[in-house]
Every structure is written in structure tokens, then in C-alpha cells.
């Protein structure tokens, strides 16, 4: 299976490193410093 | 309250097959992947099978890959362990399990945080 | 592949003594700075049941006087004060992301 965070969740975090999450068939972001949500914004 | 209840155990010979089912409860049953851990007789945990939420993705060890293959229907909280080719080191009792998890700043932290009671599988001729 | 492997294989303690069973994985089980080690308590005739999960974290409803420590490779579930109720086989688990997700073989606890 292709990884999301490389095709239409490659702009989704903002200020952080998308990653996903297998298990749960999701994706989140691992923020940079200072930002916090979903989408580190 | 969650509940795991495993059936379709039971006596097979070398080479047979047969289907487990879990039925789920009390809990959104598509919101967590799913895992099949045996026991055999006297011995200690080995993880079988895990599914993800969607069944899009699928995970085995090396002793059963290509022999049994894990599935769920989420619109009947169920989740299958279809095990073909049987020998006799599959006999145990077979746990289905709920992966429970954190994921908080982009980790992932999981665990199996409810058991059923087990059904056993004997592979006897 | 990472092998978990557990010692003692089998432990006497008595009530009220301190019992602490060790789990030693062949690579690293960490991710910056997070540990993906769980332990498991079977007592007979019964389904595993979590105690700790990401190495220290008491599972809900767990009594206090479990306790789990360690990273990287070396952890240890300690019980403070051994109950009889505490007899049972207990397990460690990792849990990082790649797959097979082993078990170590377990270790029987005992009242001495």
C-alpha cells in the first residue's frame, strides 16, 4: 500500500512531519517546536 | 463493557482448516486494529495475526504466513482467522485481541488492553 | 526479528516481599525517548490481562504496587509488596511498529 503522507496527505502538516499510522489506517503529525494541532499550524 | 468472544475452535487433522470468529462489544469496533495471539499447551504467548482498522492492512509471522489469513467485517463487529494447511505445532488456544492505544504529538503507542476467553484448536489425526 | 527474553524463568517471593522480573530485547524497543514494552499478568485458566504499557504506565485499575521501568533494552516490572493474589505467569510484550510483535517466554511467579 502507498503511503498517504507521499500522495494526497503531502501538504497536510503544516509545520511538522506527517506520518502514518498503519493500525489505524490514519495520518498525523509530529509538530515542530511552537506548533501544536492537528495540522501543526 | 468490552467483550471478545472467540468460537469456531475444535479437533482437526493434519492439513485440515477452519475458521475462528471473534464477536466484539462494547466499544466502536472499527476504531481499532485487531490481533490473534495463541497459546499452546503449557507454553508462553505467541502473536499470530493483527489486522488494521479498515483491513486494509494485514501482518503475520513467519509460522503461518501463507497458511491462515485474517479478516474482519466491521458492520458486524467481527473479526476471522481463516487457518488452512494445519499442523499439529497449531494446536493452542487462540486469543483474540483489542489493540489499545496513545497517540498524542505523532507517536503511536499500542498494546492489547482486552483479551477473549480463547478457543482451542487441536490438530490431531 | 527482536527476541524478548525474560528472567528469571521462575520466581519465590514471599507475601508482602518485593518481587522484580526482567526483560532483556536483542535491539533497542525505543523511538525518541519512548519505550514500546508492555507486560502482561496470566494467572491459570485465564486470558492475559495488560498491567503496563509504554514501560511504566499503569493500565486502569492496575493496583499501585505494580510498577514498570527501563528503556532501550532492559526493563523490569517490579511488585512492591507480593499478594497472593499476585500469583500468576507474566509477560513481556514489544510493541513497536514492525512486526513479528514477540513476546518474551514468560516468567511463573510463586509465594515462597
Known amino acids: 500500500k502507498k503511503n498517504p503522507c507521499n500522495a494526497e496527505f503531502q501538504n497536510f502538516c503544516i509545520h511538522g512531519e506527517c506520518k502514518y499510522i498503519e493500525h489505524l489506517e490514519a495520518v498525523t503529525c509530529k509538530c515542530q517546536q511552537e506548533y501544536f494541532g492537528e495540522r501543526c499550524g | 463493557e468490552v467483550q471478545l468472544v472467540e468460537s469456531g475452535g475444535g479437533l482437526v487433522k493434519p492439513g485440515g482448516s477452519l475458521r475462528l470468529s471473534c464477536a466484539a462489544s462494547g466499544f466502536t469496533f472499527s476504531s481499532y486494529a485487531m490481533s490473534w495471539v495463541r497459546q499452546a499447551p503449557g507454553k508462553g504467548l505467541e502473536w499470530v495475526s493483527t489486522i488494521s482498522t479498515g483491513g486494509s492492512h494485514t501482518y503475520y509471522p513467519e509460522s503461518v504466513k501463507g497458511r491462515f489469513t485474517i479478516s474482519r467485517d466491521n458492520a458486524k463487529n467481527s473479526l476471522y482467522l481463516q487457518m488452512n494447511s494445519l499442523r499439529a505445532e497449531d494446536t493452542a488456544v487462540y486469543y483474540c485481541?483489542?489493540?489499545?492505544?496513545?497517540?498524542?504529538?505523532?507517536?503511536?503507542?499500542?498494546?492489547?488492553?482486552?483479551w477473549g476467553q480463547g478457543t482451542l484448536v487441536t490438530v490431531s489425526s | 526479528d527482536i527476541v524478548m527474553t525474560q528472567s528469571p524463568d521462575s520466581l519465590a517471593v514471599s507475601l508482602g516481599e518485593r518481587a522484580t522480573i526482567n526483560c532483556k530485547s536483542s535491539?533497542?524497543?525505543?523511538?525518541?525517548?519512548?519505550?514500546?514494552l508492555n507486560w502482561y499478568q496470566q494467572k491459570p485458566g485465564q486470558p492475559p490481562k495488560l498491567l503496563i504499557y509504554a514501560a511504566s504506565n499503569r493500565e486502569s485499575g492496575v493496583p499501585d504496587r505494580f510498577s514498570g521501568s527501563g528503556s532501550g533494552t532492559d526493563f523490569t516490572l517490579t511488585i512492591s509488596s507480593l499478594q497472593a493474589e499476585d500469583v500468576a505467569v507474566y509477560y513481556c510484550?514489544?510493541?513497536?511498529?514492525?512486526?513479528?510483535?514477540?513476546f518474551g517466554q514468560g516468567t511463573k511467579l510463586e509465594i515462597k
Open positions: 485481541a483489542r489493540h489499545g492505544y496513545l497517540l498524542y504529538e505523532g507517536y503511536y503507542e499500542w498494546y492489547f488492553d482486552y
Open positions: 510484550q514489544q510493541s513497536t511498529e514492525n512486526p513479528p510483535y514477540t
Open positions: 535491539q533497542s524497543v525505543d523511538y525518541e525517548g519512548h519505550s514500546f
